[in-house]
């Protein structure tokens, strides 16, 4: 069997949801000593980067200029050390947002509910789209989908304090082209005092894996980075359409 290097990790810097005409940044974390990284889009070569000096850098950033629906889709990366190529990374789905119109998000029975109540979000967009997406702030990878002609509903069932937080919705014109985001709706779930004080609240910062962790080698960093790479390849997960 042909020998290959371990697959790199591909990430979007800050977010995989990129407003149209803005620049996206993807990171490919490979290995110290890699002389070339390649970014592939829908199976075709999109960009090349050759780090300098290769032995001091464990990954590269790829900038995707002027984001639009023709550059939204599935990206992957590979790297080379000498003549030996790595396996392909997992696929990363890059989405263009701020296309066309803005939906309206509402919640029933209201934004302030008690623990155990049934809650439903409604996302409405009058232009032609059939798929709607609901995202919770700080949980952008956990996308809920629903379908409808101009409105979709997202039944949450009986809520707990874990459902507290800010929500936005999008209309989707295809898997990779989304509308402007709705205005946020903040859901406040109150429980009894004991539950509320112990209930974990979701972080409002972006997902931790939506961050580039590229390093320059100094001393022990090479060993640490190798451990980090192996661990993250083992635990890394990403959303699928």
């Amino acid at each position: 069997p042909k020998q290959t290097l371990p697959k790199p990790i591909i990430r979007a810097e800050s977010t995989y949801m990129v407003p149209k005409e803005k620049q996206a940044t993807l990171c490919c974390q490979g290995s110290y000593g890699a002389v070339e990284y390649q970014l592939h889009f829908e199976g075709s070569l999109f960009a090349v980067e050759r780090p300098k000096p290769p032995e001091r850098i464990n990954g590269v950033k790829f900038h995707i200029p002027d984001m639009n629906s023709r550059k939204a889709g599935r990206y992957s990366c590979i790297y080379r050390v000498g003549e030996l190529w790595s396996e392909r990374s997992d696929l990363l789905d890059l989405v263009v947002t701020e296309m066309y119109d803005t939906p309206t998000l509402s919640v029933h029975p209201g934004p302030e509910v008690t623990s155990g109540e049934k809650v439903t979000f409604y996302c409405r967009l009058d232009t032609a789209t059939s798929m709607f997406l609901l995202l919770k702030e700080g949980r952008s990878r956990d996308v809920q989908r629903s379908y409808g002609k101009v409105q979709a509903e997202f039944p949450m069932g009986p809520v707990t304090t874990a459902h507290r937080g800010s929500y936005r919705c999008f209309g989707s014109y295809n898997n990779y082209a989304w509308s402007f985001p709705s205005e946020p709706v903040k859901l406040l779930v109150t429980g009894d005092i004991e539950n509320t004080s112990l209930a974990p609240t979701d972080p409002t910062f972006p997902d931790s894996w939506d961050t580039c962790l590229l390093t320059r080698e100094t001393g022990l960093q090479k060993d640490l980075a190798l451990w980090d790479h192996t661990a993250q390849n083992h635990h890394h997960h990403h959303h699928h359409h």
Epitope: A47, V48, E49, R50, K52, K61, H63, P65, D66
Partner: nanobody, 127 residues
Framework: QVQLVESGGGLIQAGGSLRLSCVAS????????MGWFRQAPGLEREFVAG????????YSPDSVKGRFTISRDNAKNVLYLQMNSLKPDDTAVYYC????????????????????WGQGTQVTVSS
Amino acid sequence: QVQLVESGGGLIQAGGSLRLSCVASERSLTLYAMGWFRQAPGLEREFVAGISRTGDTTYSPDSVKGRFTISRDNAKNVLYLQMNSLKPDDTAVYYCAASATYSATNIYTHQRAYGDWGQGTQVTVSS
């Protein structure tokens, strides 16, 4: 946006050399990663060579590697493609393209990465 004008094409014997130029008007080319593509009749547009904003890094596919060399002169706002050992298969319209990018070092190989295109210059290699 940047206006791009190619020149240097023509009819050449197999084995000969040509140098294509691409001049950018108005905006400074230092803001752009650049590339050369070609399109033969009835075929898809094909990537031929790419160069980073700084000019430090270049990339070409195997089909032209060792024969075609891309370079740039940012002071003069010109992109070049030196084509040696030309073959009849190299006959095509050659286009230069520019991609406004934050990256000083990325090289783009995909048509969709490029926002600005020239009108093209015809290269015909006779046997």
